[in-house]
């Protein structure tokens, strides 16, 4: 059985303040069944950025329809970027369970924010 890969192709992304940022993530397999979540930072304190199942993420949308059968693209778009959004973002695959079990993380994408051009 091929090992699941979580692919974040860009090591870094630079966005002007006020613009939207797209953070790309694909998985190499539909198996095992379970959600993808996005986090900022690593370790115990990491911040939840997007979770399809539940939560309040007014500035974050999925690029593809994550409910679509056979979807393997879990990229997100964050709107109206500010300097406070800078950081390293991780796309993380979980195995469905009670609770869900973390399986694999992408390598991370560092988001930097440029001053808005005048």
């Amino acid at each position: 059985e091929e090992e699941l890969q979580v692919i974040q192709p860009e090591k870094s992304v630079s966005v002007a303040a006020g613009d939207s940022a797209t953070l790309n993530c694909t998985v190499s397999s539909l198996i095992p069944v379970g959600p993808i979540q996005w986090f900022r930072g690593a370790g115990p304190g990491r911040e939840l950025i997007y979770n399809l199942k539940e939560g309040h993420f007014p500035r974050v949308t999925a690029v593809s329809d994550p409910t679509k059968r056979n979807n393997m693209d879990f990229s997100i778009r964050i709107s109206n970027i500010t300097p406070a959004d800078a950081g390293t973002y991780y796309c993380v695959k979980f195995r469905k369970g009670s609770p869900d079990v973390e399986l694999k993380s992408g390598a991370g994408t560092e988001l930097s924010v440029r001053a808005k051009p005048s």
Epitope: F39, G41, P44, G45, E47, L48, E54, H56, G87
Partner: antibody, heavy 117, light 108 residues
Amino acid sequence: DVQLVESGGGLVRPGESLRLSCAASGFTFTNYAVTWVRQAPGEGLEWVSLISVTGTTYYADSVKGRFTISRDNSKSTLYLQMNSLRAEDTAVYYCAKVTWKNVFDYWGLGTLVTVSS
Amino acid sequence: EIVLTQSPGTLSVSPGERATFSCRASQTVGSKLAWYQQKPGQAPRLLIYDANTRATGIPARFSGSGSGTEFTLTISSLQSEDFAVYYCQQHTDWPPYTFGGGTKVEIK
């Protein structure tokens, strides 16, 4: 405005139990880790326990096996169940919001726990 | 576990003067060091993280420096509201999160 309000402290005897609560408001509670830090009278800060956004729990060695941290996201509330309390657990217990940098950016005012016979 | 040692334990400074105190880590923490201020009867307040980044709303008179195992917090011109206890905390290796023993800044 971010607010964290602890409650549940009080005077208990050694060996007894107590449950602390921390009501959070002003931020999306589900999106952040939260933690407990304590301060014995006249002493410095000691980290006690943390619960991540996914529910993973972490404890200081001094409380492992006696204290249990939990969260109720529907109530935006953090808890600390403290069993088999000892005199050395006497302290002000603070809850704090954890940033993605693993620092504590907002703190409650604390609740005093006194363990004495 | 990373042990943080702060010095001096107490610092006596006159208002308007510069105050500098240090935090030494038992092993390298890179730039992952934070500073907190605590006034009597109050909760701690985050001042600095990543060794030199001021937290939201913290005045420019507070500055942090250092990397590896040696760190410094400087208050360029002490105001009356700055007399307090200051704690360092490493945020690179967890658990446990560890704090230094504190430096008390008192009025000379």
